[in-house]
């Protein structure tokens, strides 16, 4: 499903990825156009009754009729009953010798809060982004990336870890969310769906995109990841939606062309260094930001999420390669590796641009604008 363009917002600068689909409110379909994509049913990290989203968390949308081809529950992977969301929250990274975070999967046992109690926390990720409810924060300046253009050597480790494809990044990739908010990149990985089924983790007004890239960063205030886990701002993730476009994305092809080599779960290969920034949208000035969690166990909270307004374009063939090449645990395809969207529970998503300003027909409706928390100060 593609988002119809109502009022195109040209990106700043020409991105090498050829992406040109911003996510401002003006580009979102009306409620009639946009059914909420179904999340995996009965997922183990579903909120308890006390965590059920309020009106501000979920878009009011009309369910699509079956004739319109809505995604049915029986089409999705079966999962076990939800785990007990009452377990105490614990953001601490468990010691490697203890109950590690490797024994989990999308759907089924064990329930994620049993793997890591933090997965039952109140401020989890991913979330549904409603641009009209985002607080415009002029203090959110354009992101700064330094050292992301890597030389071919040394090569980088690309691994099928059974949950995603992950590229480990070398030291020296610096990212700033703003003055005094400095990070270094650790790794990037992707989330995707299956044939005809989108698989982004975040959604926009209930719309799920074909795929999503996450670049995970560690705050320079911490020497080690385990020190930063669960600490506010200890980790930061840059996220961008991947959409279908007419042309092959040459930056992504450098990775996608190697997936066949790591089709088997646990397999890994070396890839030449590349321009990591070319995997992201070109417009670093327009984004949404909120505090959430890792989207997989240990689900540690305090993670600063920055979701680009602009999307990245891949060809249909490339999106198919991404979703149809890798294998996961138990001889099953590695597909639909996204977590259900989690309730905001009062969190306000901030925007670096006036995302709620709308000239589409919906502007006639009352617009609720949240106030900026000035997180960028």
């Amino acid at each position: 499903q593609r988002l119809p363009r109502m009022q195109e917002d040209s990106p700043l600068g020409g991105g090498s990825s050829g992406e040109d689909d911003p996510l401002g409110e003006e580009d979102l379909p009306s409620e009639e156009d946009s059914p909420r994509e179904e999340d995996p049913p009965g997922e183990e990290d579903l909120p308890g009754e006390e965590d059920l989203p309020g009106e501000e968390d979920l878009p009011e949308v009309k369910p699509k009729s079956e004739e319109e081809g809505s995604l049915k529950l029986e089409d999705l992977p079966t999962v076990e009953a939800p785990g007990d969301p009452q377990e105490p929250q614990n953001n601490a990274h468990r010691d490697k010798e203890g109950d590690d975070q490797s024994h989990w999967r999308y759907g089924g046992d064990p329930p994620w809060p049993r793997v890591s109690p933090a997965c039952a926390g109140r401020f989890q990720s991913p979330v549904d982004i409603r641009p009209q409810l985002a607080a415009f924060c002029p203090a959110l300046r354009p992101l700064e990336l330094l050292g992301f253009q890597l030389p071919p050597l040394p090569e980088l480790r690309l691994r099928n870890n059974g949950h995603s494809v992950q590229l480990t990044l070398p030291p020296g990739l610096e990212m700033a969310l703003g003055p005094g908010r400095e990070y270094r990149a650790l790794q990037l990985h992707l989330h995707w769906g299956a044939a005809g089924r989108p698989g982004s983790e975040h959604t926009v007004e209930g719309h799920r995109f074909p795929a999503e890239i996450h670049v995970v960063h560690l705050s320079t205030a911490f020497a080690r990841v385990d020190e930063a886990l669960g600490r506010p701002g200890g980790l930061a993730v840059l996220a961008a939606f991947l959409e279908e476009g007419p042309e092959e994305n040459s930056a992504y092809e450098q990775l996608l062309s190697r997936l066949e080599e790591i089709a088997e779960e646990g397999s890994e290969t070396q890839v030449p260094g590349l321009d990591i920034s070319a995997l992201l949208p070109s417009d670093f000035s327009r984004y949404f930001q909120y505090e959430g969690s890792l989207t997989t166990p240990p689900c540690a909270q305090g993670v600063i999420w920055t979701v680009f307004n602009q999307t990245v374009m891949l060809s249909a063939k490339q999106l198919h390669t991404l979703s149809d090449t890798l294998w996961g645990p138990g001889d099953s395809r590695l597909q639909l590796n996204f977590r259900a969207t989690q309730p905001l529970n009062g969190r306000v998503i901030e925007a670096s641009f006036p995302a709620g300003v709308d000239s589409s027909p919906r502007a006639a409706e009352p617009v609720q604008l949240n106030s900026c928390l000035a997180a960028g100060d």
Epitope: P154, T168, L186, Q187, V225, E264, E265, G266
Partner: antibody, heavy 122, light 107 residues
């Protein structure tokens, strides 16, 4: 606490196949990489290869034609077979777990067996 | 294969001394470097991984630094139990390779 224990014959004849098993206790063999590393007497360490719990393998090219590593998740064991051995294969053989930092992607040999000396001699 | 060269091959030091062992890779290995301690008749013990991350349970007197081709293991104040052989190991590319070892002896 994860523990690894190598077992197998301490003496193998030249041209025969060396067979060792590593039993993992105190933790599951699932979701990790399991390696074999050897150390000739008085010398340094040489990586032989690894197997992922699902069966994916990677071998040292210098030994690849003679090495097979397999895993039995039901027994929490993995095994090494080295064919056509010579005296140069005499070494202490260690099994080790190759841990994996889920966030950074970096890995490391964090748990080792105590090692077993295998002598190749007629 | 990536060659790992340690220096010195052996070093004599006293309890309380600060000791530095270096490891050089024949080509860039980013931060894919680990340091091990091995005592006679025992298996190697992981001290440092990812060039500078201290393994759980390892005393803080051990530290690692470097990236690319040049790496350092530092023991800030030698203790009697630190006399052993130390190995560096790269995991940037296969095959995984080890340095030849540095023997730390009592002066």
């Amino acid at each position: 606490q994860v523990q690894l224990q190598e077992s197998g014959p301490g003496l193998v004849k030249p041209s025969e196949t060396l067979s060792l098993t590593c039993t993992v206790s105190g933790g599951s063999i699932s979701s990790y990489y399991w390696s074999w590393i050897r150390q000739p007497p008085g010398k340094g360490l040489e990586w032989i290869g690894y197997i992922y719990y699902s069966g994916s393998t990677n071998y040292n090219p210098s030994l690849k034609s003679r090495v097979t590593i397999s895993v039995d998740t039901s027994k929490n064991q993995f095994s090494l077979k080295l064919s056509s051995v010579t005296a140069a294969d005499t070494a202490v053989y260690y099994c080790a777990r190759r841990g994996y930092d889920f966030l950074t992607g970096y890995d490391y040999f964090d748990y080792w067996g105590q090692g077993t000396l295998v002598t190749v001699s007629s | 294969d990536i060659q790992m060269t340690q220096s010195p091959s052996s070093v004599s030091a006293s309890v309380g001394d600060r000791v530095t062992i270096t490891c050089r890779a024949s080509q860039g290995i980013s931060s894919w470097l680990a340091w091990f301690q091995q005592k006679p008749g025992k298996a190697p013990k992981l001290l440092i991984y990812a060039a500078s991350s201290l393994q759980s349970g390892v005393p803080s007197r051990f530290s690692g630094s470097g990236s690319g081709t040049d790496f350092t293991l530092t023991i800030s104040s030698l203790q009697p139990e630190d006399f052993a052989t130390y190995y560096c190991q790269q995991a940037n590319s296969f095959p995984i390779t080890f340095g030849q070892g540095t023997r730390l002896e009592i002066k």
